[in-house]
Interface confidence: low
């Protein structure tokens, strides 16, 4: 029979390969069937009989077409700082990811081996880089004209309110206190972000303030009406 209509097991043509979802068994020297996900090879093929597959036992799995003699063990149960985002089934391993407010400090092939709590920026400091699934929060001191009065892993430095009459000037950890009834918020370019040095993560050829709608973007020049061009020696 031509190879494309052959039934397993069959000998491949010289120099030929086995078809999709088949494997070449070195002992039998035949093309034999693989087992589907969720099963494993209970009995390997011979020259006259095809692979015998059997379902994976509880807490074991195979994710791919295979000819493994035993299914893989599912990972251990998720720890208290993790949540199970994918349950252990016969076809897939358990996947544990970090809880909200935590990040993966040590990853593994799928999911996370070790979670750590996102650091909190204390008053006077704001989030310069938000935490991600795999990286911690980075804090920076609030620049003049901005403040953060919280201990938080999400709050950025915010601009001081502008008073008609100032009762108490603001500082890095406290907003300005006004005596008038209608304070306004500073809208200085980049004021809601902490200025920091030019970043290689910026997509610009020279740094420019990020739009105020992007709190995660913090690669800015100092707060002010007209940031100096790169290489400027101005204050």
């Amino acid at each position: 029979l031509p190879a494309q209509v052959a039934f397993t097991p069959y000998a491949p043509e010289p120099g030929g390969t086995c078809r999709l979802r088949e494997y070449y068994d070195q002992t039998a020297q035949m093309c034999c069937s693989k087992c589907p996900p969720g099963q494993h090879a209970k009995v390997f093929c011979t020259k006259t009989s095809d692979t015998v597959c059997d379902s994976c036992e509880d807490s074991t799995y195979t994710q791919l077409w295979n000819w493994v003699p035993e299914c893989l063990s599912c990972g251990s149960r998720c720890s208290s700082d993790q949540v199970e985002t994918q349950a252990c089934t016969r076809e897939q391993n358990r996947i544990c990811t970090c809880r909200p407010g935590w990040y993966c400090a040590l990853s593994k092939q799928e999911g996370c081996r070790l979670c750590a709590q996102l650091r909190k920026c204390r008053p006077g400091f704001g989030v310069a880089r938000p935490g991600t699934e795999t990286s911690d929060v980075v804090c920076k001191p609030c620049a003049p004209g901005t403040f953060s009065n919280t201990t938080s892993s999400t709050d950025i430095c915010r601009p001081h309110q502008i008073c008609h009459v100032v009762a108490i000037p603001g500082n890095a950890s406290m907003d300005a206190v006004c005596t008038s009834t209608s304070p306004t918020r500073s809208m200085a370019p980049g004021a809601v972000h902490l200025p920091q040095p030019v970043s290689t993560r910026s997509q610009h050829t020279q740094p420019t303030p990020a739009p105020s709608t992007a709190p995660g973007t913090s690669f800015l020049l100092p707060v002010g009406p007209s940031p100096p061009a790169e290489g400027s020696t101005g204050d």
């Epitope: 650091r119 911690d136 804090c139 001191p141 620049a143 890095a172 040095p197 993560r201 740094p207 204050d235």
Partner: antibody, heavy 119, light 106 residues
Framework: EVQLQESGPVLVQPSQSLSITCTVS????????VHWVRQSPGKGLEWLGV???????DYSAAFISRLSISKDNSKSQVFFKMNSLQADDTAIYYC?????????????WGQGTTVTVSS | EIVLTQSPALMSASPGEKVTMTCSAS?????MYWYQQKPRSSPKPWIY???NLASGVPARFSGSGSGTSYSLTISSMEAEDAATYYC?????????FGAGTKLEIK
């Protein structure tokens, strides 16, 4: 015990590049950033750049065109590379640790590596 | 960039004398940091967040200031305090250091 150790010392020809490795111990590069600072003979301190715990980098605008900082967390090493060195780049080069969420001081410094640019 | 001007550049003090050195910023900064450096040694953190003493720093040291004017004070000079002191800011791009105040013992 927290330690930072720069490789070196180094003699570099003018227009050539400089590579320094800062090997750290006693803390993880996934939790702390590392700054690079230099000090010219008889002069003060000059900040060059930083690599953050998350791998991001920031450079002084004066050096951004010729400076590159990278790291290997698993080997606890930070790599510093500066191109096109001239005589006025002769200095002691330091790496220093900084907690990204802490007091924001460079709390531990390497002993420094002496870099001489000369033909 | 923000320029930090330290004064005096060089000063000497007798044991027991009160010492004050200043750091003036060309623009307002949120916090000031101070480092101590002795010859043939790396800088050491000395004062952080304007007024907090780093670990191991004697209580005779203090830091103060706001805006553009900051100072480091030693209430009673001791021989081991002879060193160069640098101020540092990172409230704006780039992080900058002052040129240093060299403090000698009389």
């Amino acid at each position: 015990e927290v330690q930072l150790q720069e490789s070196g010392p180094v003699l570099v020809q003018p227009s050539q590049s400089l590579s320094i490795t800062c090997t750290v111990s006693g803390f993880s590069l996934t939790s702390y950033s590392v700054h690079w600072v230099r000090q010219s003979p008889g002069k003060g301190l000059e900040w060059l750049g930083v690599i953050w715990s998350d791998g991001g980098t920031d450079y002084s605008a004066a050096f951004i065109s010729r400076l590159s900082i990278s790291k290997d967390n698993s080997k606890s090493q930070v790599f510093f590379k500066m191109n096109s060195l001239q005589a006025d780049d002769t200095a002691i080069y330091y790496c220093a640790r900084n907690d990204d969420g802490g007091d924001y001081a460079m709390d531990y410094w390497g002993q420094g590596t002496t870099v001489t640019v000369s033909s | 960039e923000i320029v930090l001007t330290q004064s005096p550049a060089l000063m000497s003090a007798s044991p027991g004398e009160k010492v004050t050195m200043t750091c003036s910023a060309s623009s307002s900064v949120s916090y000031m940091y101070w480092y101590q450096q002795k010859p043939r040694s790396s800088p050491k953190p000395w004062i952080y967040l304007t007024s907090n003493l780093a670990s191991g720093v004697p209580a005779r040291f203090s830091g103060s200031g706001s805006g553009t004017s900051y100072s480091l004070t030693i209430s009673s000079m001791e021989a081991e305090d002879a060193a160069t002191y640098y101020c540092q800011q990172w409230s704006s791009n780039p992080l900058t250091f002052g040129a240093g105040t060299k403090l000698e013992i009389k």
